[in-house]
């Protein structure tokens, strides 16, 4: 899995959407979780609804809430009032029984102030062996979000 | 094991810059945030702000804003704070701290300390 | 800022005494995420800080289990069961819930 940068700024909120294959994922919940440590279990933040049919429902933990388009393929999370605590590596993910498929991995950036936008370059980090030109980096910026496809080293 | 090397003391003349530096060992550098904090004489500790290796991103604390200025060198895994117009309220020892949380803020806590540099300010 | 206010700020002990050091925040440190971001540093010496206890009662990994730490509302207390050697030193308590980070004046304990 690639992993995808979404940047937002303190105060205000960031939204991550995580598509994946509607049918391939027909009546599965999701959840978003943290990985907390190099290596270590990811820890579940939020998980949407039991019944898998309201999962359109935005359900919250604190300031954490996921809402779920099953039909369209997309997985929301929304992260409000965004704290330097929220930054971290996280995984949205798709749930079979005691199971759980990584849909997307999220790298979670908050920045002090808008001005501390970098540009896409900086976006970019290596993995053990990849050089610049291997970095495939898409990048849209708006007030509080930027987000871009980034390389990343494993995380085993 | 983890190590944060911090660079040596630095005696300066009002008005002057410093760059101190701490460099990293043993763990990937760009995977944790990196704090620094002031220690004056016989005081308490202060913060500064932290930044996160990876991306070059800085949250600063509004006090030390126009005097800190936070860097890293991933080549090198170390980081850099340069502190400017240097007075003698700038005489302290300082700290790197490494946060303790995989790609999180070092607002977690911070789970390993470096060295520590200590600045004197004199004429 | 968050105002973290240490007590006392001089601790004389024997070894093999319990100790116990306070520290309170002049507002709540309950993050909106749910944890409370109090963390316990003890600086021997010369040396640098090291973490003892974070997120109020979690022990950093080696700190024996004679530390403990518990919380009150704004209140919060590091104790040492029974103090060695090699407790002795300048205890912070640290807030990091709030911006910006902050640290308490810090407990000397030292030998009677």
């Known amino acids: 899995h690639n992993t995808t940068v979404f940047q937002g700024v303190a105060g205000q909120s960031l939204q991550v959407s995580c598509p994946y294959d509607s049918m391939k994922h027909w009546g599965r919940r999701k959840a978003w979780c943290r990985q907390l440590g190099e290596k270590g279990p990811c820890q579940r933040v939020v998980s949407t609804h039991n019944l898998w049919l309201l999962s359109f429902l935005r359900r919250w933990n604190g300031s954490t809430a996921i809402t779920d388009d099953t039909l369209g393929g997309t997985l929301t999370i929304t992260l409000r009032n965004l704290q330097p605590h929220d930054a971290g590596l996280y995984q949205c993910q798709s749930l079979h029984g005691s199971e759980a498929d990584t849909l997307r991995k999220v790298l979670v950036e908050v920045l002090a102030d808008p001005l501390d936008h970098r540009d896409a370059g900086d976006l970019w980090f290596p993995g053990e062996s990849e050089s610049f030109e291997d970095a495939h980096v898409e990048h849209s910026i708006s007030r509080s979000l930027l987000e871009g496809e980034i390389p990343f080293p494993p995380t085993s | 094991q983890v190590q944060l090397q911090q660079s040596g003391a630095e005696l300066a003349r009002p008005g002057a810059s410093v760059k101190l530096s701490c460099k990293a060992s043993?763990?990937?550098?760009?995977?944790?945030?990196l704090s620094w904090v002031k220690q004056r004489t016989g005081q308490g500790l202060e913060w500064i702000g932290e930044i996160y290796p990876r991306s070059g991103n800085t949250y600063s604390n509004e006090k030390f804003k126009g005097k800190a200025t936070l860097t890293a060198d991933k080549s090198s895994s170390t980081a850099y704070m340069e502190l400017r117009s240097l007075t003698s309220e700038d005489s302290a020892v300082y700290f790197c701290?490494?946060?303790?949380?995989?790609?999180?803020?070092?607002?977690?806590?911070?789970?390993?300390w470096g060295t520590g540099t200590t600045v004197t300010v004199s004429s | 800022d968050v105002v973290m206010t240490q007590t006392p700020l001089s601790l004389p002990v024997s070894l093999g005494d319990q100790a116990s050091i306070s520290c309170s925040s002049s507002q709540s440190l309950v993050h909106s995420n749910g944890n409370t971001y109090l963390h316990w540093y003890l600086q021997k010496p010369g040396q640098s800080p090291k973490l003892l206890i974070y997120?109020?009662?979690n022990r950093f990994s080696g700190v024996p289990d004679r530390f403990s730490g518990t919380e009150s509302g704004t209140d919060f207390t590091l104790k040492i069961s029974r103090v060695e050697a090699e407790d002795l030193g300048v205890y912070f308590c640290?807030?990091?819930?709030?911006?910006?980070?902050?640290f308490g004046a810090g407990t000397k304990l030292e030998l009677k």
């Open positions: 640290s807030q990091s819930t709030h911006v910006p980070l902050t």
């Open positions: 701290a490494k946060g303790g949380v995989y790609y999180g803020s070092s607002y977690w806590y911070f789970d390993v």
């Open positions: 043993g763990y990937t550098f760009t995977s944790y945030a």
């Open positions: 997120k109020v009662s």
